[in-house]
């Protein structure tokens, strides 16, 4: 018995508006109905917690209302967005999924996904 | 799946010693680092030490004091606590996490990255 596998991709490009979005998949062993997602971030050997949701599996992922982060989910798979990113915030960003019910309790982690954020360059003023 | 129960717990004096003890069952311990944390009365749950299969780490205020170490052939992992002052009276509880390429010895001990939580186990120093 392993610890339950997560996979998300190595490398993300925010967009110029500070968004990121990325895949996040776990291998259930079981058939849970309650699952719940969090998002950590490592960087500089500091880590945080990024956001987190409990979601009954069908049903719409909801964070909180300050959240930074979005989220679908369709079976063992979650698409997460994070909004707001800086160019401070690149990091490595790692998907946690806890299967919390029915038990038996799972723990899985990925290997994480590296979000660089580039801040957009100000727009020059125009002589017209 | 891992089932984690911890025990060892109890009074001590200041100065004197205890051993935890934190034992596994329903998978190997090898794809796991294992931490034990402790929370005081009115306080956050602090790291603090954890243990993989090549590294261990501490907390600043336990170092030189207690020892981690594991029996992976058992499913066992150990806390060995010497020179217990008072403030090291807290519920301590052991938890695991799966070994990740991108711990360092600076995180891989973060509370962030566990589950498999035990009940806890009560530590007290007192004369």
């Known amino acids: 018995c392993k610890a339950m596998h997560v996979a998300q991709p190595a490398v993300v490009l925010a967009s110029s508006r500070g968004i990121a979005s990325f895949v996040c998949e776990y291998a259930s062993p079981g058939k849970a109905t309650e699952v719940r997602v969090t998002v950590l971030r490592q960087a500089d050997s500091q880590v945080t917690e990024v956001c987190a949701a409990t979601y009954m599996m069908g049903n719409e992922l909801t964070f909180l209302d300050d959240s930074i982060c979005t989220g679908t989910s369709s079976g063992n798979q979650v698409n997460l967005t994070i909004q707001g990113l800086r160019a401070m915030d690149t990091g490595l960003y790692i998907c946690k999924v806890e299967l919390m019910y029915p038990p038996p309790y799972y723990l899985g982690i990925g290997n994480g996904t590296q979000i660089y954020v580039i801040d957009p360059e100000p727009c020059p003023d125009s002589d017209f | 799946e891992v089932q984690l129960v911890e025990s060892g717990g109890g009074l001590v004096q200041p100065g004197g010693s205890l051993r935890l003890s934190c034992a596994a069952s329903?998978?190997?311990?090898?794809?796991?680092?294992i931490g034990w944390f402790r929370q005081a009365p009115g306080k956050e749950r602090e790291t603090v030490s954890c243990i993989n299969r090549s590294r261990t780490s501490y907390a600043d205020s336990v170092k030189g004091r207690f020892t981690i170490s594991r029996d992976n052939s058992k499913n066992m992992v150990y806390l060995q606590m010497n020179s217990l002052r008072a403030e090291d009276t807290a519920v301590y509880y052991c938890?695991?996490?799966?070994?990740?390429?991108?711990?360092?010895?600076?995180?891989?001990?973060?509370?962030?990255?566990?589950?498999?939580w035990t009940q806890g186990t009560q530590v007290t120093v007192s004369s």
């Open positions: 329903g998978s190997t311990l090898d794809p796991f680092v």
């Open positions: 938890a695991a996490s799966p070994d990740k390429p991108f711990y360092t010895d600076q995180t891989m001990c973060n509370k962030h990255y566990y589950g498999y």
